[in-house]
């Protein structure tokens, strides 16, 4: 009679974490009599996974009725697979005796465990940055196996190329992590922009995971200022407006100075939003020209989002008939309240 062979038909088996793994094993003969044992690994450090004869193996069940006399199928199912279960499993036939002795081993089945990556988390810089500056975004995802993974960066659907990615650890592990840093150049139109990190892995079946960051949390668009003089009905009054345009975020404080003296401070409230997500705001002053003997230098000074103040000035000629006129000069940052000047915003 032909000598017994132990057949493990599957060279490798891949299972998703949490599922059950079926490891197939059949023998070609009922002789010699003796039990089957399953081991993870070979050699002196091999671990017993299942013993047909004795022992308690709560995660292991036999696929067929291995207790039947004529049974030659010794396949097993291992439940609730984790990445730590990866390795080569050997089905080993023993010859009955005192003690039982190893007779023949199967060729082994390599079990690999697939684990999904966690949802990518994208984080941006701690401080806001202005257009034309380059900022860094990081993307992290953890807990995946096998190690092979693909990560891409996008800004508003356009793929980015300036990034560096590391998968850790460099050696073998039950699971892996990915960390990527992308560099993004900000533009004035980026308030509504998104940066997206996309992770593709064998466990995701072609449906990648995405993490996003809104550039609205990263960008600061400084305002542009324009001070203009408006003609008014009364001969002795001039309306001067300060147009604060294209700024983000909304946090903004405006101070009017007359000849370097603070006349009024107000905070942007009723702003208008532009299509690109930036804001516009206007503040005005009604100046009683008759109260002034000399020319008046009016300065609109804006402190945006805690940054150093920017300003624009307007020289008001009191001797001349009120006309629309304006000039840009630096303003002083000191002063006191001045009468005969009335203001508002909108």
């Amino acid at each position: 009679e032909e000598e017994l062979q132990v057949i493990q038909p599957d060279k490798s088996v891949s299972v998703a974490a949490g599922e059950s793994a079926i490891l197939h094993c059949t023998v070609t003969s009922l002789i010699p009599v003796g039990p089957i044992q399953w081991f993870r690994g070979a050699g002196p450090a091999r671990e017993l996974i299942y013993n047909q004869k004795e022992g308690h193996f709560p995660r292991v069940t036999t696929v067929s009725e291995s207790t039947k006399r004529e049974n030659m199928d010794f396949s097993i199912s291992i439940s609730n697979i984790t990445p730590a279960d990866a390795g080569t499993y050997y089905c080993v036939k023993f010859r009955k005796g005192s003690p039982d002795t190893e007779f023949k081993s199967g060729a082994g089945t390599e079990l690999s465990v697939r684990a999904k990556p966690s949802a990518p988390v994208v984080s941006g810089p701690a401080a806001r940055a202005t257009p034309q500056h380059t900022v860094s975004f990081t993307c992290e995802s953890h807990g995946f196996s096998p190690r092979d993974i693909t990560l891409k960066w996008f800004k508003n659907g356009n793929e980015l190329s300036d990034f560096q990615t590391n998968v850790d650890p460099v050696g073998e592990s039950v699971s892996y992590s990915i960390h990527s840093t992308a560099k993004v150049v900000l533009t004035r139109e980026d308030v509504h922009s998104q940066v997206i990190c996309e992770v593709a892995h064998v466990t995701l079946q072609g449906d990648p995971l995405r993490g996003t960051a809104n550039l609205s949390e990263t960008i600061r668009v400084p305002p542009t200022l324009e001070v203009t003089q408006q003609p008014v009905r009364a001969e002795n009054q001039v309306n001067v407006t300060c147009q604060v345009r294209k700024f983000y975020p909304q946090r903004l404080q405006l101070t009017w100075l007359e000849n370097g003296n603070v006349s009024r401070t107000e905070t942007a409230s009723t702003v208008t939003e532009n299509k690109d997500g930036t804001y516009n705001w206007m503040s005005w002053l009604l100046v009683n020209v008759s109260a002034h003997r000399d020319d008046v230098k009016l300065t609109c000074q804006v402190e945006h989002d805690g940054q150093p103040a920017v300003s624009k000035s307007h020289d008001l000629k009191v001797s001349a008939h009120p006309k629309e006129q304006g000039s840009n000069t630096a303003a002083e940052n000191t002063g006191s309240n001045e009468r005969n000047i009335y203001g508002g915003s909108g």
């Epitope: 993870r40 690994g41 070979a42 050699g43 002196p44 450090a45 091999r46 671990e47 990866a86 390795g87 080569t88 050997y90 080993v92 010859r95 002795t101 190893e102 007779f103 023949k104 081993s105 060729a107 082994g108 390599e110 050696g171 073998e172």
Partner: antibody, heavy 122, light 112 residues
Framework: QVQLQESGPGLVRPSETLSLTCTVS????????WSWIRQPPGKGLEWMGF???????FYNPSLKSRVTISLDMSMNQFSLKMTSVTAADTAVYYC????????????????WGQGTTVTVSS | DIVMTQSPLSLPVTPGEPASISCKSS???????????LDWYLQRPGQSPQLLIY???NRASGVPDRFSGSGSGTDFTLKISRVEAEDVGVFYC?????????FGGGTKVEIK
């Protein structure tokens, strides 16, 4: 192609601890035994011990009380520590990979590092 | 521990001629699964050892077929059918059945 590279100090003082690291490149740590073998000048080979991918260790009883082998799969490295060294521990130290796929025995030490010479001297 | 004894200690050879090295173990290396866990290694001068034969008679990958291993139980033999100049060095047998793994004392093969 799997390669092994030993690293560590070439000179150790008597009574101190010898520490060597073997870096595995081009292959998997899994399913193999990772061994340390030494060869005193002009003498034969002596097996010191090995570690399996599951962390189980086996040591030569003649050295057991002094030797520790550890495995860092995340760095693809395994290490040897031997305490209380004497001049008799002067040798070329090899790290090696041992195959196992047929039962309780082993199926050949098929990959060796180039060896690192360790001298124990004051 | 299993004691491994090699003979001869030194073996002068003529290129093109056969050569034979003996290795004896203090206990049987034949396991119940039918495998004899004995390896043969060659250490060329200034180099690391190289695996030639495992399980008594299986040639390792890349080893020329002029090397062959035989034997079972406690008596094993390594044969070189036609010695070549590159075969000079020290040949070691090693038992791989149980720990501690033990080596023979080595056989130095040199050209006559």
């Amino acid at each position: 192609q799997v390669q092994l590279q030993e690293s560590g100090p070439g000179l150790v003082r008597p009574s101190e601890t010898l520490s060597l690291t073997c870096t595995v490149s081009g292959g998997s740590i899994r399913n193999y035994y990772w061994s340390w073998i030494r060869q005193p000048p002009g003498k034969g080979l002596e097996w010191m011990g090995f570690i399996y991918d599951n962390g189980r260790t086996f040591y030569n009883p003649s050295l057991k009380s002094r030797v520790t082998i550890s495995l860092d799969m995340s760095m693809n490295q395994f290490s040897l520590k031997m305490t209380s060294v004497t001049a008799a521990d002067t040798a070329v130290y090899y790290c090696a990979r041992v195959r196992a796929y047929s039962g309780i025995g082993l199926d050949g030490t098929d990959v060796w590092g180039q060896g690192t010479t360790v001298t124990v001297s004051s | 521990d299993i004691v491994m004894t090699q003979s001869p200690l030194s073996l002068p050879v003529t290129p093109g001629e056969p050569a034979s090295i003996s290795c004896k173990s203090s206990q049987s290396l034949l396991y119940s699964n039918g495998y004899a866990y004995l390896d043969w290694y060659l250490q060329r001068p200034g180099q690391s050892p190289q695996l030639l034969i495992y399980q008594g008679s299986n040639r390792a990958s890349g080893v020329p077929d002029r090397f062959s291993g035989s034997g079972s139980g406690t008596d094993f033999t390594l044969k070189i059918s036609r010695v070549e100049a590159e075969d000079v060095g020290v040949f070691y047998c090693m038992q791989a059945l149980q720990t501690p793994l033990t080596f023979g004392g080595g056989t130095k093969v040199e050209i006559k």
